[in-house]
């Protein structure tokens, strides 16, 4: 058993049929010694008396808010949560496996630049009685500070018969140098509580590996005389690290119709302009990627050909 | 501690091409090592990230773009002094700071070159003959060092009398290649910045 936060405790249980469970001793936070009784949740049934209560925690029915009273007055509370371990593996029932970039990916994180700011998100099908708490650091043995905000519900989607909820959190490394060469990874830890179930999820990464620039901005077209060709120009996204001559991007320019199966023109360039062949009913799209360290491409920025 | 904005004329910077070749060569070598040593811990997640130049050179700090010198987090650098005469310095106006940056890059390359050559000598003794260093990568390191053209004491190649542990050598190769790729990215960024300035 360990304390998650004040008056909230996590009981770690090996979860298998007829498991013996864990013996837990609760102590009432009071100077009083006599006349103390214990109850669980909203029940008025007295579970025991005295300053301490010893219970055998085996299942979710044994978890919940234990309260000690004296003469109708509440003295203190202890909330017990269960953390299940099945076949030596901690449960991951609360969050959905996003399977990208690999199986057992519950947390996904991205950074728009090298400033030390990043966003992580996760998915769940649970809509109520759900809380998240996020902590982060650079390195684990001698951790350096990373400050995370509160996790918020950022999107709701319908997937078949199910509703899917996306939560996200923004974090900022306390003292980040965009030009630094990372040798210790960022660690992100998410505590998830659904009703009386506790789970924790972690992710470890270097900022350089989660870079995904914003799409290029200000796409403009200039038809070339006596030619099917069009000059397309754009600018670096505002959110990208500066100076751009140090933090350079490379670009992919594509002309394509509405269907992915349609024919296309595609060219890669380090410049902020390119010449492509425009077709009726097609769009010109441009996306960006760090020129020197190949992490993710940005989303496309698009303009119609006409 | 930082790169000045008034540096060589565009297109007059011979090291840019070499640094691009360097990043390409080390990236290819790292990819080859990951594939060949698939049953060894050779991915970024599996290895310890070590920097053999730590406390010996200060490339990131010495080569910091002027725009980042206002960032306090970028300025906790170690002061290191280097010899300052390089052929990549294509302008007479080149500052001492830029010379310091380029000489720091030269020292990095020299240290990695020695490590890689020592390691290759060990790998050539491996009866499995599983992996060797790409000669192209070693040649590209050499070309960039020649383009930088700094006079520097030659570092003797480390020789070892004991029987090499090939498993450890291959893991060390992975560690070295990961670190060198990160440094090659920094070098490429620096050369691009200098070329544009």
């Amino acid at each position: 058993i360990w304390e998650l936060k004040k008056d909230v405790y996590v009981v770690e249980l090996d979860w298998y049929p007829d498991a013996p469970g864990e013996m837990v001793v609760l102590t009432c936070d009071t100077p009083e010694e006599d006349g103390i009784t214990w109850t669980l949740d909203q029940s008025s049934e007295v579970l025991g008396s005295g300053k301490t209560l010893t219970i055998q925690v085996k299942e979710f029915g044994d978890a919940g808010q234990y309260t000690c009273h004296k003469g109708g007055e509440v003295l203190s509370h202890s909330l017990l949560l269960l953390h299940k371990k099945e076949d030596g593996i901690w449960s991951t029932d609360i969050l959905k496996d996003q399977k990208e970039p690999k199986n057992k990916t519950f947390l996904r994180c991205e950074a728009k630049n090298y400033s030390g700011r990043f966003t992580c998100w996760w998915l769940t099908t649970i809509s109520t009685d759900l809380t998240f708490s996020v902590k982060s650091s650079r390195g684990s043995s001698d951790p350096q500070g990373v400050t995370c905000g509160a996790a918020t519900l950022s999107a709701e989607r319908v997937r078949g018969d199910n509703k899917e909820y996306e939560y996200s959190v923004e974090c900022q490394e306390d003292s980040a140098c965009p030009a630094a060469e990372e040798s210790l990874p960022i660690e992100v830890m998410v505590d998830a509580v659904h009703k009386l179930k506790y789970e924790n999820y972690t992710s470890s990464f270097f900022i350089r590996d989660i870079i995904k620039p914003d799409p290029p901005k200000n796409l403009q077209l200039k038809p070339l005389k006596n030619s099917r060709q069009v000059e397309v120009s754009w600018e670096y996204p505002d959110t990208w690290s500066t100076p751009h001559s140090y933090f350079s991007l490379t670009f992919c320019v594509q002309v394509q119709g509405k269907s992915k199966r349609e024919k296309k023109d595609r060219v890669f360039t380090d410049k902020t302009s390119a010449t492509v062949i425009c077709r009726k009913n097609a769009s010109i799209s441009v996306r960006a990627q760090d020129r020197y360290y190949s992490s993710s491409w940005s989303e496309w920025a698009s303009v119609p050909c006409s | 501690r930082n790169l000045p904005v008034a540096t060589p004329d565009p297109g007059m910077f011979p090291c840019l091409h070499h640094s691009q070749n360097l990043l390409r060569a080390v990236s290819n070598m790292l990819q080859k090592a990951r594939q060949t040593l698939e049953f060894y811990p050779c991915t970024s997640e599996e290895i310890d990230h070590e920097d053999i130049t730590k406390d010996k050179t200060s490339t990131v700090e010495a080569c910091l773009p002027l725009e980042l010198t206002k960032n306090e987090s970028c300025l906790n650098s170690r002061e290191t002094s280097f010899i300052t005469n390089g052929s990549c310095l294509a302008s007479r106006k080149t500052s001492f700071m830029m010379a310091l940056c380029l000489s720091s890059i030269y020292e990095d390359l020299k240290m990695y070159q020695v490590e890689f050559k020592t390691m290759n000598a060990k790998l050539l003794m491996d009866p499995k003959r599983q992996i060797f260093l790409d000669q192209n990568m070693l040649a590209v390191i050499d070309e960039l060092m020649q383009a930088l053209n700094f006079n520097s004491e030659t570092v003797p190649q480390k020789s070892s009398l004991e029987e090499p542990d090939f498993y450890k050598t291959k893991i060390k190769l992975c560690i070295l290649l990961h670190a060198f790729r990160i440094r090659a990215v920094t070098i490429d960024r620096v050369m691009s910045y200098l070329n544009a300035s």
């Epitope: 099917r228 024919k263 296309k264 023109d265 595609r266 060219v267 890669f268 360039t269 010449t275 009726k280 | -």
Partner: antibody, heavy 118, light 107 residues
Framework: QVQLVQSGAEVKKPGSSVKVSCKAS????????LHWVRQAPGQGLEWMGW????????EYAPKFQGRVTITADESTSTAYMELSSLRSEDTAVYYC???????????WGQGTLVTVSS | DIVMTQSPLSLPVTPGEPASISCRAS??????LHWYQQKPGQAARLLIY???QSISGVPSRFSGSGSGTDFTLTISSLQPEDFATYYC?????????FGQGTKVEIK
């Protein structure tokens, strides 16, 4: 399976014209760009131009501009390359090639030898 | 026009040995480079597109690398069927241009 079948060899006199055909099978004809590339004996490959069969748009290499005409007939899934004012240095194998991507070629025809000789 | 220069023009190789062909562009072309194989009397066959992207059906011993002006096609272990002429082609700008070709011959 996508295939490009070209017309047979031709012998032409200098100053005349030649029209080579390229019939496509497998896949929708207008879903691909079609190019013409030639190869003189013992020489390398030389790009001549492309057509978008969907709308008839064409683009030619400056070297052949005014002398080459690429056309396409959607009803027969056939593309044509006509080269006029032939000279001896136009003796070459002419290939048609296609792709959904405009700038490179993933399927090639078997080639048509055009010999220009007096 | 962008000029593509291949080297060597002739490459004698022992079967089973690796082979590398170089292609250099007269100006930077990013990764807009493609590789083809051509055997005598046959049409060309696409091997690699956009410098390093492999084609399904092409053996994994063929790989490409490079960007900017310098590119390499590598055949990790030459098989008898690989003796042919190899061409690089740039697609950075029109007109599309090819290298002169590299003939890989049996040593």
């Amino acid at each position: 399976q996508v295939q490009l079948v070209q017309s047979g060899a031709e012998v032409k006199k200098p100053g005349s014209s030649v029209k080579v055909s390229c019939k496509a099978s497998g896949g929708t004809f207008s879903d691909y760009y079609l190019h013409w590339v030639r190869q003189a004996p013992g020489q390398g490959l030389e790009w001549m131009g492309w057509i978008d069969p969907e709308n008839g748009d064409t683009e030619y290499a400056p070297k052949f501009q005014g002398r080459v005409t690429i056309t396409a007939d959607e009803s027969t899934s056939t593309a044509y390359m006509e080269l006029s004012s032939l000279r001896s240095e136009d003796t070459a194998v002419y290939y048609c090639a296609r792709n959904k991507e405009l700038r490179y070629f993933d399927v090639w025809g078997q080639g048509t030898l055009v010999t220009v000789s007096s | 026009d962008i000029v593509m220069t291949q080297s060597p023009l002739s490459l004698p190789v022992t079967p089973g040995e690796p082979a590398s062909i170089s292609c250099r562009a007269s100006q930077s072309i990013s990764i807009n480079l493609h590789w083809y194989q051509q055997k005598p009397g046959q049409a060309a066959r696409l091997l690699i597109y956009f410098a390093s992207q492999s084609i399904s059906g092409v053996p994994s011993r063929f790989s490409g690398s490079g960007s900017g002006t310098d590119f390499t096609l590598t055949i990790s272990s030459l098989q008898p069927e690989d003796f042919a002429t190899y061409y690089c082609q740039q697609s950075n700008s029109f007109p599309l241009t090819f290298g002169q070709g590299t003939k890989v011959e049996i040593k």
